[in-house]
């Protein structure tokens, strides 16, 4: 079949970081400087891509493949391949139109990105809530209230993580 | 414009070796990418052989493994390094670059 094709069509044989060049005749000819082609028996290459601005050089292009982008510190990559940058926003909140805001009581963001997500509501699974939430943290589901009735085994909360420099209060 | 002048052709066995040379001159600071290209008797020119403008050697599958091309920038050359040379290696041999081509230089291979 590989043969057969060869013979009607000679631009399948050109390989990749090569194209087929109609202004000769359809030999293969190499991909000009800052071009490529990553598959063979192309009939162009394509431009690289340049990442500029925001977008700063993860892989530099070859003959055979393309840029690849990602963001420079403080943005995040959004779509397919990296086609956007996006502004990060802190732990706790979320971007708007307007800029990072603080995400609204009883929601919560753990993420430099990505939306304010409602906290968990515990009581739907029967459970109660054994540690709050804040605008970083979901709660944290402890033992439903019958399981906290006395004779019940009590399970004892994890002590709070200390910071640093903080002492115990 | 570019002036490419090839060289190293010859008569060689099955098996033999042989290292063409393509000197370049003039405005040779617009040479990006070279490459070598051979044409057989009554077939069409087609490519063997490439340095690409990021600088890395290709080869068409039928040169891989036997050919090497490499380029000598202090003498503004370029080379084709044939080796475990077939009977289908023989053709005219041309040194290109963008609009530039060579003269060719011939090589035969027979027994």
């Known amino acids: 079949f590989e043969r057969t094709r060869s013979l009607q069509d000679p631009c399948s044989n050109c390989p990749a970081g090569t194209f087929c060049d109609n202004n000769r005749n359809q030999i293969c000819s190499p991909c000009p400087p800052n071009s490529f082609s990553s598959a063979g028996g192309q009939r162009t290459c394509d431009i690289c891509r340049q990442c500029k601005g925001v977008f700063r050089t993860r892989k530099e292009c070859s003959s055979t493949s393309n840029a690849e982008c990602d963001c420079t510190p403080g943005f995040h990559c959004l779509g397919a391949g990296c086609s956007m940058c996006e502004q990060d926003c802190k732990q706790g909140q979320e971007l708007t139109k307007k800029g990072c805001k603080d995400c609204c009581f009883g929601t919560f963001n753990d993420q430099k990105r990505g939306i304010c997500r409602p906290w968990t509501n515990c009581s739907l699974d029967g459970k109660s809530v054994l540690v709050n939430g804040t605008k970083e943290r979901d709660v944290v589901c402890g033992p439903s209230p019958a399981d906290l009735s006395p004779g019940a085994s009590s399970v004892t909360p994890p002590a709070p993580a200390r910071e640093p420099g903080h002492s115990p209060q | 414009a570019v002036q490419l002048v090839e060289s190293g052709g010859g008569l060689v066995q099955p098996g033999g070796s042989l290292r063409l040379s393509c000197a370049a001159s003039?405005?040779?600071?617009?040479?990006?990418?070279i490459s070598w290209y051979r044409q057989a008797t009554g077939k069409q020119r087609e490519l063997v052989a490439w340095?690409?403008?990021?600088?890395?050697?290709h080869y068409v599958d039928s040169a891989k493994g036997r050919f090497t091309i490499s380029r000598d920038n202090t003498k503004k050359t370029t080379y084709l390094q044939m080796n475990s040379l077939k009977l289908e290696d023989t053709a005219v041999y041309y040194c290109?670059?963008?609009?530039?081509w060579g003269q060719g230089t011939q090589v035969t291979v027979s027994s």
């Open positions: 290109n670059s963008g609009d530039s």
């Open positions: 003039g405005n040779i600071f617009d040479i990006r990418v």
């Open positions: 340095i690409a403008w990021d600088n890395v050697a």
